[in-house]
C-alpha cells in the first residue's frame, strides 16, 4: 500500500518524490495528480512540469519548493484542509513506452491537537516540534518499467519515502505542555 504522510490543518504538507537526471540537467516531465496513479498520465492533475518549468498548476497552493532542476519534484501543498486528504500520484514521465515511474503517496490531514502551553513555554509550536519520527523506509509504492530503456541516458533513482508521524504527545510532554 502507499506510504502515508501526516499534516495538520492549516499547515503545509510535504509529499516527497525525486529522480536523478542523467546527465545533470536532462530533466523529464513530471505530473502530480490527486488519486492513485492510473495506467496513463495523471488523473486530476494538480501540477505538471515539462523539461524546463512548472507549466500547469491547478491552484496556487501547489508548489515544487525543492530544486526540481536536480530532480527534486516533491510536492508542497500549502495551508492544507481536510479535503486535501487522500492518495496522490507522482509520475516521472521517462521517455519510452511504459517507462514511467509511478509513486503513490497518501496524505492524511488531521485537525490540530488542542494544546495548552505551560507558562514557561513561550516558543511557537511549529518550532517546538520540528522533529518527525521515522518509522521505516520503503521502496517504490508502485513502479512500472516493462518497456525498453529510454533513448536519453536517464537514471531514475530508487524512489524512497519514509513514514513520518508527528509525535506531538511526546514533544509536548518533554516541553511541559499539557494535552486536553
Amino acid at each position: 500500500s502507499e506510504v502515508e504522510y501526516i499534516a495538520e490543518v492549516g499547515q503545509n504538507a510535504y509529499l516527497p518524490c525525486s529522480y536523478t537526471p542523467a546527465p545533470p540537467g536532462n530533466l523529464v516531465p513530471v505530473c502530480w495528480g490527486k488519486g492513485a496513479c492510473p495506467v496513463f498520465d495523471c488523473s486530476n492533475v494538480v501540477l505538471r512540469t515539462d523539461n524546463r518549468d512548472v507549466n500547469d498548476r491547478t491552484s496556487g497552493r501547489y508548489w515544487l519548493k525543492g530544486d526540481f532542476h536536480k530532480g527534486d519534484v516533491s510536492l508542497t501543498i500549502e495551508n492544507v484542509t481536510l479535503a486535501d486528504s487522500g492518495v496522490y500520484c507522482c509520475r516521472i514521465q521517462i521517455p519510452g513506452i511504459m517507462n514511467d515511474e509511478k509513486h503513490n503517496v497518501k496524505l492524511v490531514v488531521i485537525k490540530p491537537a488542542k494544546v495548552t502551553p505551560a507558562p514557561t513555554l513561550q516558543r511557537d509550536l511549529t518550532s517546538a516540534f520540528p522533529r518527525m519520527l521515522t518509522t521505516g523506509e520503503h521502496g517504490p509504492a508502485e513502479t512500472q518499467t516493462p518497456g525498453s530503456l529510454p533513448d536519453v541516458n536517464l537514471t531514475v533513482s530508487n524512489f524512497f519515502c519514509e513514514l513520518q508521524i508527528f509525535t506531538l504527545t511526546n514533544e509536548l510532554r518533554d516541553s511541559g505542555a499539557t494535552i486536553r
Epitope: G35, A36, C37, P38, V39, F40, D41, S43, N44, V87, P95, I97, M98, N104, Q144
Partner: antibody, heavy 116, light 107 residues
Framework: EVQLVESGGGLVQPGGSLRLSCAAS????????MSWVRQAPGKGLEWVAN????????YYVDSVKGRFTISGDNAKNSVYLQMNSLRAEDTAVYYC?????????WGQGTLVTVSS | ETVMTQSPAILSVSPGERATLSCRAS??????LAWYQQKLGQAPRLLIY???TRATGIPARFSGSGSGTEFTLTISSLQSEDFAVYYC?????????FGQGTRLEIK
C-alpha cells in the same frame, strides 16, 4: 459543444486494411490524449489503442499490436486508426473517445466488418 | 490482465425504485474505476470516474462507491431513461479493461 465524428468503416476481407478517422471539435485537441475503443456485435467494450497528446507515445492492446497504428494530426484536429491484416475477430463498432484512462465523450462509432 | 466481473448480468427493477449494480476487480484498482451507460444503438456515456465522481451533466441520482476490488453503482430512483446497459472499467492496471455489463430492465 465537444464532438467526435468517426468515419472510414465498412466491409473488408480478412487480411485487408482499413483506415478509420475521427474528427474532433469543441475542445483544444492538442491538449488531450485520444483513444479507440471497440465493441463486437452484441458484446462488451474493449479498449484498443490510445495516443498521448503530441503523439510522442502510442499504446495498444496485445491483440492488435503490430497490426493497428494510431496517429494524430493536430492541424486537422483528427485521430486515425490504420488497421492492417484484419481478422474476423476485429469485426466491431469502433468508437473514438477523448481521454487516456476514462473516456468522455465518445463518437457515434463506425462499423467495421471483416468477412469473406 | 485485470478481470472485471459485473453482477448481476440482468437486473429487473421498477421505475422509482433503487438499483444497485456491482463490479468486482480481480486485483486492486484503487479508486481508478469508471462507470458508463449505453443505450441500444448509442455510444457509451461516462457516468462516474475515480469510483465516485460524477461526470459533467450526470444527475445526482447516480452515485458510485467502493475502492480496491469492490465497487457499486447506485441509481437512487430509476427513471424511464435509465434502463440501459451499464459497464464498469478499470484504469489502474495494464491494459484498461471493462466489465461484461449489467443490463438494467424494467420490471
Amino acid at each position: 459543444e465537444v464532438q467526435l465524428v468517426e468515419s472510414g468503416g465498412g466491409l473488408v476481407q480478412p487480411g485487408g486494411s482499413l483506415r478509420l478517422s475521427c474528427a474532433a471539435s469543441g475542445f483544444t485537441f492538442s491538449s488531450y490524449w485520444m483513444s479507440w475503443v471497440r465493441q463486437a456485435p452484441g458484446k462488451g467494450l474493449e479498449w484498443v489503442a490510445n495516443i498521448k497528446r503530441g503523439g510522442s507515445e502510442r499504446y495498444y492492446v496485445d491483440s492488435v499490436k503490430g497490426r493497428f497504428t494510431i496517429s494524430g494530426d493536430n492541424a486537422k484536429n483528427s485521430v486515425y486508426l490504420q488497421m492492417n491484416s484484419l481478422r474476423a475477430e476485429d469485426t466491431a463498432v469502433y468508437y473514438c473517445a477523448r481521454g487516456s484512462n476514462w473516456f468522455d465523450p465518445w463518437g457515434q462509432g463506425t462499423l467495421v466488418t471483416v468477412s469473406s | 490482465e485485470t478481470v472485471m466481473t459485473q453482477s448481476p448480468a440482468i437486473l429487473s427493477v421498477s421505475p422509482g425504485e433503487r438499483a444497485t449494480l456491482s463490479c468486482r476487480a480481480s486485483q486492486s484498482v484503487y479508486s481508478n474505476l469508471a462507470w458508463y451507460q449505453q443505450k441500444l444503438g448509442q455510444a457509451p456515456r461516462l457516468l462516474i470516474y475515480d469510483a465516485s465522481t460524477r461526470a459533467t451533466g450526470i444527475p445526482a441520482r447516480f452515485s458510485g462507491s467502493g475502492s480496491g476490488t469492490e465497487f457499486t453503482l447506485t441509481i437512487s430512483s430509476l427513471q424511464s431513461e435509465d434502463f440501459a446497459v451499464y459497464y464498469c472499467q478499470q484504469y489502474n492496471n495494464w491494459p484498461i479493461t471493462f466489465g461484461q455489463g449489467t443490463r438494467l430492465e424494467i420490471k
